[in-house]
Interface confidence: low
């Protein structure tokens, strides 16, 4: 009968051939009388037989993700009576992997958007890189995740590639970071292959941040002939948070002669100063009001970052008419 | 249409300093890596600096290090190169290249036609 | 750093030939290797990224190859516009480097 072991190749050897192995009858003596014959793909241009031994040579290099087994066949002629000395018989080469591949990232480019603010280990994406090396093949395909970019804010699990939130980041500071993850193979040992990918994380406004006036008093002008509803002058506060998150409202705190109010413009975010009782020079010639500005929308979580509206103050100086 | 287009060129005595510009159109600016690279005339190029998508991490050729500073600014989709204590060596064209994606993000894609820098006295 | 180097400087070819332009590494860097054209006055162009990607717009006439430190650019048929400067680029390691250039002009 035919006598063999499995025949494994290595992939991608440098060398002009490799010997795989011998294939052989039991009835052979070694005296030459056999001839060996090998057919099926590959036979003759990646694989030879020395037709006296049976010894089997890959004569080219062979790539196992382009291909990981050939299926050949054998024979064994007596050479005085040219007859089959075994039955034609079946037999695989298995092309064994080589950590020849690095680990890539198929779905870059990766971006994400996390609420500013986030607390430690919120999950921010996961990536996940891909190798083509045999994942049943020692570690040639097992990968570590690493952070080559990103510290001290993110974190990202070693066998997960999940990117968590590793530190609290302020929008209002940087609202976009760039990490850099590092896919090794091999588990990190010697002679491990790597990729890498950016992912944009963009920071998403939360409301932590309270309006504030930008001066601390305002000087308006007021006609004694001004009807009621005239609008005075305007005021402004500045919020660092952006979109419905800077919207705000602005109010009266202070005022005992009741004779002002103030509106909101939504659009522009300003505080109108509105008379709301005519006024009489020689009846009170100046006054003086408080107000405050607080956001539109405030969740309840974030009324910590709220507390204590900003107020400013405003002086108002009534103009003289003549009257008749 | 992506395009690049250099400016801040000119002519400066030995030791003096320059500021290039590299206004960019056609992509997300801060999504690539953005190089400089140089010819001096009848020369070949020179890979000089590049600086990641976003900025955080930049890279020079060791015959600018300390002199020759690299940044960008988003919010103008522009990319500068600064450049201190010029040297005679340093007369080239300047082109400003755009990385690619994903495995090519450190190379050159896209280049502008480059601003002249003549260093001399 | 790694040293590109080109060969040969000068190649001189007449229209429709095959030019077969190569570039070394001084040591593997995989297939991190671009190919560019450069023309009097112009800025250069991307050809081959990847050692043999074609970048967008590149004829198939244009073909790369090789990996490690061996590569090759090939213009199978030559047309009046491939006469040029072209340089290899590795982007592997830094420094990125460049090749000297070969000159391909008319025979």
């Known amino acids: 009968g035919w006598v063999w072991n499995q025949f494994f190749v290595p992939e991608e050897m440098n060398t002009t051939s490799h010997h795989i192995g011998q294939l052989r009858s039991d009835l052979d003596n070694g005296n030459n009388s056999f001839q060996y014959k090998l057919l099926g793909a590959g036979a003759g241009s990646t694989f030879i037989i020395d037709e006296r031994t049976g010894d089997i040579y890959a004569i080219q290099k062979l790539d196992r993700e382009e291909r990981s087994l050939y299926i050949l066949r054998a024979q064994v002629i007596d050479i005085a009576t040219g007859r089959a000395v075994e039955p034609e018989s079946e037999f695989v080469i298995k092309v064994s992997d080589i950590n020849d591949n690095e680990p890539k990232f198929l779905d870059e480019p990766y971006e994400a958007i996390v609420p500013e603010m986030s607390p430690e280990g919120t999950l921010v994406i996961q990536v996940t890189a891909s190798d083509a090396d045999d994942p049943s093949s020692g570690n040639n395909a097992r990968l570590l995740y690493s952070l080559l970019q990103g510290q001290p804010y993110f974190s990202v699990e070693p066998t997960t590639g999940v990117i968590r939130i590793s530190s609290k980041m302020d929008r209002e500071l940087q609202d976009e970071y760039w990490v850099i993850i590092q896919a090794k193979d091999m588990i990190g040992q010697p002679g491990a292959l790597s990729g890498t990918t950016s992912v944009l994380i963009k920071l998403s406004d939360v409301n932590d941040n309270k309006p504030i006036f930008k001066e601390s008093l305002y000087r308006l002008t007021v006609s004694e002939s001004a009807p009621t509803g005239t609008s005075i002058g305007t005021i402004m506060a500045y919020d660092n948070d952006i979109g419905e998150n800077a919207e705000m409202d602005y109010s009266i705190e202070e005022d005992d002669s009741q004779t002002f109010d103030i509106i909101t413009n939504h659009e522009t975010q300003e505080g109108i100063v509105i008379l709301k009782k005519k006024v009489d020079f020689e009846h009170q010639n100046h006054y003086g009001i408080r107000a405050k500005v607080k956001n539109h929308h405030v969740p309840e979580q974030l009324m910590k970052y709220h507390t204590e509206a900003s107020t400013t103050f405003i002086k108002i100086q009534v103009e003289d008419v003549d009257e008749p | 249409e992506v395009q690049l287009l250099e400016s801040g060129g000119g002519l400066v005595q030995p030791g003096g300093s320059l500021r290039l510009s590299c206004a960019a159109s056609?992509?997300?600016?801060?999504?690539?890596?953005m190089n400089w690279v140089r010819q001096a005339p009848g020369k070949g190029l020179e890979w000089v600096s590049t600086?990641?998508?976003?900025?955080?991490?930049?890279y020079y050729a060791d015959s600018v290090k300390g002199r020759f500073t690299i940044s960008s600014d988003n919010s103008k989709s522009t990319l500068y190169l600064q450049m201190n204590s010029l040297r005679a060596a340093d007369t080239a064209v300047y082109h400003c290249?755009?990385?690619?994606?994903?495995?090519?993000?450190?190379?050159?894609?896209?280049w502008g036609q480059g601003t002249t820098v003549t260093v001399s006295s | 750093e790694i040293v590109m180097t080109q060969s040969p400087v000068t190649l001189s070819l007449s229209l429709g030939e095959r030019a077969t332009l190569s570039c070394r590494a001084s040591?593997?860097?995989?297939?991190?290797l671009a190919w560019f054209q450069q023309k009097p006055g112009q800025a250069p162009r991307l050809l081959i990224y990847?050692?043999?990607t074609r970048a967008t717009g590149i004829p198939a006439r244009v073909s790369g190859s090789g990996s490690g430190t061996e590569f090759t650019l090939t213009i199978s048929s030559l047309q009046s516009e491939d006469f040029a400067v072209y340089y290899c680029?590795?982007?592997?390691?830094?420094?990125?480097?460049f090749g000297g250039g070969t000159k391909v002009e008319i025979k």
């Open positions: 290249a755009k990385g690619g994606m994903g495995g090519y993000y450190y190379g050159m894609d896209v």
């Open positions: 056609g992509f997300t600016f801060s999504s690539y890596a």
């Open positions: 600086i990641s998508g976003g900025g955080a991490n930049t």
């Open positions: 040591q593997s860097i995989s297939s991190n």
């Open positions: 990847g050692a043999f």
């Open positions: 680029q590795q982007y592997n390691y830094w420094p990125l480097t």
